[in-house]
């Protein structure tokens, strides 16, 4: 299936130009999406192009500015948050990034009723996290690892925790590993639905080993960055969950929520918290060996002022073939009875589907089924359940939004998006207003992205929110590559691939091939989305064929494929890339003397192992910020897929799956190794060890480090990186500059 038809028309051929590297580095062809900031069933906020904060009412069709750009500019605000009672707005400035999600900022509170900033009892700076209560205008914030509460923005703060200490005790915010590998948020506190209670996590990192690396900066001596970072098999953070009554916070203080006995018996993680009602909360826990998850529903005991988690309200989810869940264990979406819920987990055939759980998991009612997967539950109302899946036309790399009418029997299913803009849009997400009165659909491709507003009852499109007209016009004279998504059937495994072909592609000619790989567990690279990026340029201007292949270990095609890599990372992911390359060669248009592979992060690990596979298939390759040994990576991620690096568990495969063990095999390939020295995620240590092994084996290779850059290699480093990689590939493929 050709996803993006060529835009080359013979009559206009002379006015068309290829993409340039400059186009990519300047972000010339980037797109916009529109996610309404919903504040009710029919109202949303949006920051206009001139930075005014505008409130839109869908039903009246009216809009008005609630906060002017002048007020925003007066404190250099880059973000805002309206209190639910609409009396105040917080303005966020001095944004300072920490890790993937976390940052610190300065916060100002603006009083909408008098048009002035709140003076007196100002917030300290910098704040690590701040949020409004869901009702009214209470504030909870984290400062210096402690949590504070304000009943009103101008009130003095009430200090909830006192033991917060940098790199030791984290209250209301996650430590490094929980932020990156478990919660995927910058916060670890949760308001109850009406703001009566505030739940928070306390992470104790006292005994965690510390990763230390130099940050060179501009001073005479480099700084040392220290992060408590548990690598595979190391001591993990110890987590506790507390809940405090925010109406009378000093009355009994924070109350700890008990951990299920079957979880507490050995090392464990807290994985998520979901409020059900003001007096019912749902916590999810996970054994350190991540194949057992427990969902625990806890109730407030008014008489004791404590939280009770009866064993009858514990639901166990266990995987016998891999780890629990997909990338993360899914979270429940509760029904209106405030006890039963909908959740995605594997069915008996090994496909992730929506189940309805009331009394026990054993009695779960399967809501969706088929040889495809339900991916996300967006919203459950009294009569509808909205979810996304890759069911439509059996393409795993698509996402459509479905509605199941659960208020009647038999429940009927309707695809909301499948036929809306079929050629342009095959990969959607959605954002729902309160009670799903309205929703926004955001289409990511394969055509130019478009965001639209819809009626939640009828699904009728109300208006286009963003259609990227400027991008469409800018692309009119660009020779974009052709893209196709197809599959290979190999030994009972389906390998989906995306191929990006030069605009004037001719099957009778031979082209250099670049494999772009990620290949991490539960990832998906072959997606029907729009992108004009570096590989688009390589196809458009440099005449390369680029291929992306989803092999074993990748997601949304069932547990057989997903869990194939369990306890065996670095084997089948590599095999499947190699198998695909052989199939591509058989297609007849690949120059088998000019094949390269590149990847970043997990992709850098796979590309390194593929280059060192001894097959002779690859002439050259690039690894950006690769993992080189699973002993160097984070416990939560690594152990999920690999178990523990102990003799009685999986140490042998930890040792066998390193890049260093294959140093000798790099002798006959051109290898470019790249890493940021301030990578907090995949530590520079990984590349340092590859380099050391290659030197010790007297194997020639190329390398580039980026001083003080993290895992993302952002800013000017990005330009340097892609320019450098382009030169390397062109040299490898004997393409003239």
């Amino acid at each position: 299936i050709v996803l993006r038809p060529p835009r080359v028309h013979n009559s206009e051929e002379n006015t068309m130009r290829a993409l340039t590297l400059k186009d990519i580095l300047n972000g010339t062809f980037s797109y916009k999406t529109f996610f309404p900031n919903w504040i009710s069933g029919q109202e949303y906020l949006h920051q206009s192009a001139d930075n005014n904060i505008v409130l839109y009412n869908i039903e009246t069709g009216q809009s008005y500015t609630i906060l002017s750009n002048r007020t925003m500019k007066s404190v250099n605000a880059s973000n805002y948050g309206l209190s639910p009672d609409r009396q105040f707005v917080y303005l966020e400035s001095d944004y300072s990034k920490l890790w993937r999600y976390s940052y610190t900022a300065t916060y100002y509170i603006y009083d909408l009723s008098n048009g002035e900033f709140v003076r007196g009892n100002e917030l300290p700076r910098p704040i690590q996290y701040l949020c409004w209560s869901p009702v009214g205008s209470k504030l909870a914030y984290v400062y210096q690892n402690n949590i504070y509460l304000k009943q009103r923005p101008g009130d003095p703060p009430f200090q909830i925790t006192f033991n917060g200490r940098e790199n030791k005790i984290f209250n209301g915010i996650p430590d490094w590993v929980y932020e990156e590998e478990m919660l995927a948020t910058k916060y670890a506190l949760w308001w109850s639905p009406n703001g009566k209670f505030l739940a928070y996590a306390e992470f104790n990192d006292t005994d965690i080993p510390v990763i230390a690396y130099s940050y060179y900066g501009d001073e005479q001596y480099p700084r040392t960055i220290n992060i408590p970072y548990p690598k595979a098999g190391a001591k993990n953070p110890f987590v506790r969950i507390f809940i405090i009554d925010t109406t009378y916070p000093a009355y009994v203080g924070p109350q700890e929520v008990p951990v299920p006995a079957m979880i507490a018996s050995s090392d464990y993680y807290f994985s998520w918290l979901t409020w059900v009602t003001d007096e019912r909360v749902c916590l999810q826990w996970l054994k350190r060996v991540q194949n057992v998850s427990v969902l625990s529903i806890c109730d407030f005991r008014e008489d004791w002022q404590t939280w009770d988690c009866p064993k009858t309200q514990e639901h166990i989810e266990e995987s016998r073939t891999g780890w629990a869940g997909g990338f993360f264990v899914s979270t429940p979406v509760f029904s209106y009875d405030a006890i039963s819920y909908y959740k995605i987990f594997s069915d008996k055939d090994g496909y992730k589907h929506i189940h309805y759980i009331k009394d026990t998991v054993e009695n779960a009612i399967q809501i969706t089924s088929g040889k495809w997967e339900a991916i996300n539950i967006f919203r459950v109302t009294q009569d509808s359940l909205f979810y996304s899946s890759n069911e439509f036309e059996d393409y795993p790399g698509r996402r459509n939004i479905y509605r199941i009418s659960i208020g009647s029997y038999p429940p009927s299913k309707k695809c909301v998006t499948c036929h809306l803009r079929k050629e342009r849009c095959q990969y959607y997400t959605a954002s729902f207003s309160d009670y799903a009165k309205y929703y926004a659909l955001v289409c990511y491709g394969p055509g130019i992205p478009i965001s639209t507003l819809h009626d939640g009852r009828t699904d009728q499109e109300i208006k286009i929110l963003e259609e990227n007209k400027e991008l469409e016009n800018a692309l009119k004279n660009i020779q974009l590559p052709k893209e196709e998504i197809k599959k290979l059937e190999v030994d009972e495994i389906t390998l989906w691939y995306k191929m990006i072909l030069p605009p004037q592609f001719d099957r009778s000619k031979k082209y250099p091939l670049l494999i772009q790989v990620y290949g991490g567990p539960c990832s998906q690279s072959v997606r029907s989305v729009f992108a004009v990026n570096w590989i688009s340029y390589l196809a458009s201007k440099e005449g390369m064929v680029i291929a992306l292949v989803d092999g074993r270990g990748t997601a949304f095609q069932g547990d057989k494929l997903l869990y194939a890599v369990y306890r065996k990372l670095g084997v089948y992911e590599v095999e499947d890339q190699i198998t695909a390359v052989r199939k591509f060669i058989e297609m007849g248009f690949i120059d088998e003397k000019r094949i390269a592979i590149w990847g970043w992060s997990y992709g850098g690990y796979v590309s390194s192992l593929a280059l060192a596979s001894g097959t002779g298939l690859f002439k050259c390759g690039i690894a950006v910020a690769p993992v080189s040994s699973w002993e160097y990576y984070a416990s939560v991620y690594t152990e999920r897929f690999m178990g523990l690096p102990t003799k009685d568990d999986n140490l042998e495969h930890y040792k066998n799956s390193t890049v260093m063990a294959r140093a000798e095999y790099f002798r006959n390939v051109d290898y470019l190794l790249i890493h940021g020295t301030a990578d907090d995620n995949v530590h520079f240590q990984n590349s340092a060890q590859i380099a050391k092994a290659l030197v010790n084996a007297q194997v020639d290779f190329q390398a580039m480090w980026y001083s003080d850059q993290n895992h993302g290699l952002s800013g000017l480093s990005t330009n340097h990186l892609y320019t450098h990689m382009t030169h390397f590939l062109k040299q490898c493929f004997s393409l003239s500059d």
């Epitope: 009866p310 009858t312 309200q313 029904s335 209106y336 009875d337 405030a338 006890i339 039963s340 309805y356 009331k358 009394d359 026990t360 009695n363 009612i365 009294q382 009569d383 659960i406 208020g407 009647s408 029997y409 038999p410």
Partner: antibody, heavy 122, light 107 residues
Framework: EVQLLESGGGLVQPGGSLNLSCAAS????????MSWVRQAPGKGLEWIGE????????NYTPSLKDKFIISRDNAKNTLYLQMNKVRSDDTALYYC???????????????WGQGTTVTVSS | ELQMTQSPASLSASVGETVTITCRAS??????LAWYQQKQGKSPQLLVY???TLADGVPSRFSGSGSGTQYSLKINSLQPEDFGSYYC?????????FGGGTKLEIK
Amino acid sequence: EVQLLESGGGLVQPGGSLNLSCAASGFDFSTYWMSWVRQAPGKGLEWIGEINPDSSTINYTPSLKDKFIISRDNAKNTLYLQMNKVRSDDTALYYCAGGYYRYPYYYTMDYWGQGTTVTVSS
Amino acid sequence: ELQMTQSPASLSASVGETVTITCRASGNIHNYLAWYQQKQGKSPQLLVYNAKTLADGVPSRFSGSGSGTQYSLKINSLQPEDFGSYYCQHFWSTPYTFGGGTKLEIK
């Protein structure tokens, strides 16, 4: 008008078998959860078991699980109860009941038949 | 298996009075409770479901309440046709057991 009509009751010897039927009319039988409930003379109601619309889920009260079988034929709008190895304490009035689907995913027993009497005696 | 304990087993009341029948579950049934009325020689009739929702056609003098393990059925201003037996039944987890019943007689 909704009607549920049980039949097949009668006298049966201990250890014997009996098949009860429940003919439904006046509603869309194929979308209803159906149940069997019994009432021993002068006693209260006892839930026997349930069957969902497409017969994919059948649940029984544990004490009767191995001797009673519930089934249905949507084409014939009929619910069945096969009683095996009956004993004297199975003597009762047997009701079939039909339920509306209630959100979320359960039903109520809105419609009841008049019952059929089963007497187990030698 | 959840047990349903209904009380009182019997009570006598006069027309116009208000009566309350209670039902206790051996575990939390989260409002998954129904009440039925059965008159002598007749089939049971659904009165209340979800602990407090009146079934179609049921007079408003009937009302259900409760949560967790404790539930009750209240009949305001008793009418002659209200006399008979009353049963609760939970729908939380199978088996969906009934209470032992309450026989309401005319005083």
